[in-house]
Interface confidence: medium
């Protein structure tokens, strides 16, 4: 499955939007730093089946969408940037869903990839828990935005590697 050229443009736009959402200097939030234990191994260049990689990427973007779709994110972050981000993620998800259908034949993630998908879900659960514990403070959001920027970048790298293998 070939992801369209617009997909990588959309990835870049999503990263720019994440960067624009950050409002305060990360240096003023050093005490709030947290290790969310990003499941790096799921994004490393192990002998992924393409369908598995696409399923993991889809889960990553879907969970990102869910995280930013809450009332708490709407209250804390710039409304228009947030909406642009939703729309961008939606287009990314549409592209990946088309690919999952071609590679796997069903949209729901196959059970054989469940461990990888579960690792991504648990990662986002840790992020949500952190935000709750920190009462969705502005510094907590800065830390989370920084983390999502990093994880989103890693998922983009995986997409690039998939493309280069074609």
């Amino acid at each position: 499955c070939d992801l369209p050229q617009t997909h990588s443009l959309g990835n870049r736009r999503a990263l720019i939007l994440l960067a624009q959402m950050r409002r305060i200097s990360p240096f003023s939030c050093l005490k709030d730093r947290h290790d969310f234990e990003f499941p790096q191994e799921e994004f490393d260049d192990k002998q992924f089946q393409k369908a598995q990689a696409i399923s993991v990427l889809h889960e990553m973007i879907q969970q990102t969408f869910n995280l930013f779709s809450t009332k708490d994110s709407s209250a804390a972050l710039d409304e228009t940037l947030l909406d642009e981000f939703y729309i961008e993620l939606d287009q990314q998800l549409n592209d990946l869903e088309s690919c999952v259908m071609q590679e796997v034949g069903v949209i729901e993630s196959p059970l054989m990839y469940e461990d990888s998908i579960l690792a991504v879900r648990k990662y986002f659960q840790r992020i949500t828990l952190y935000l709750t514990e920190k009462k969705y403070s502005s510094c907590a959001w800065e830390v989370v935005l920084s983390e999502i920027y990093r994880s989103f970048s890693l998922s983009i790298n995986l997409q690039k590697r998939l493309k280069s293998k074609e």
């Epitope: 879907q62 969408f65 779709s69 228009t80 909406d83 642009e84 939703y86 729309i87 961008e88 939606d90 287009q91 998800l93 549409n94 869903e97 259908m101 949209i107 729901e108």
Partner: antibody, heavy 118, light 109 residues
Amino acid sequence: QVQLKQSGPGLVQPSQSLSITCTVSGFSLTSYGVHWIRQSPGKGLEWLGVIWSGGNTDYNAAFISRLSITKDNSKSQFFFKMNSLQAKDTAIYYCARGRGNYVPFTYWGQGTLVTVSA
Amino acid sequence: QIVLTQSPTIMSASLGERVTMTCTASSSVSSTYLHWYQQKPGSSPKLLIYSTSNLASGVPARFSGSGSGTSYSLTISNMEAEDAATYYCHQYHRSPPMTFGGGTKLEIK
């Protein structure tokens, strides 16, 4: 792949109600909402309402008194019901998938041509 | 509700010609929420451009969109036979209802 297939009557008597079913495949109903839009020669494309993934609904104020949108997650079906139809309700009725509030529609049903006539 | 007015209502263009159509909103719309669809006879609308200027998946690069505030436009740099269709602009923000323009029908000259 993602599909939305509509089924419903082509002809409705004046003052009767219209029921259309939108059966979807290729995506999870817990991640998406489905909007209903109609297209009539006189008024062009007109948004009627939406049922969100959680089951809550929003309706166009002009139709709120005679419109009902529901769904059955287990059957992957969305249901559209409009009461008290008049000749001016003659149109093509579409269901379309939306992920979030402001996201444009990438997938549409094939449309159901509804004629209101005695 | 926001009214979207498209002009012209009908236009014709020769193959290879540059085509521009406009969409004017009755009050300001953020560029994030302004989208364009293409519809051919007997088919459902197809997303063409989202958030004013971003091409939807699989849309040829000859299509482009621009604008802000109350004035938006869709341009085809090099008209092809398959571009003959009706084009609709669409806006949706936080307060329903979303609205669509009346459409611009593009024919081949």
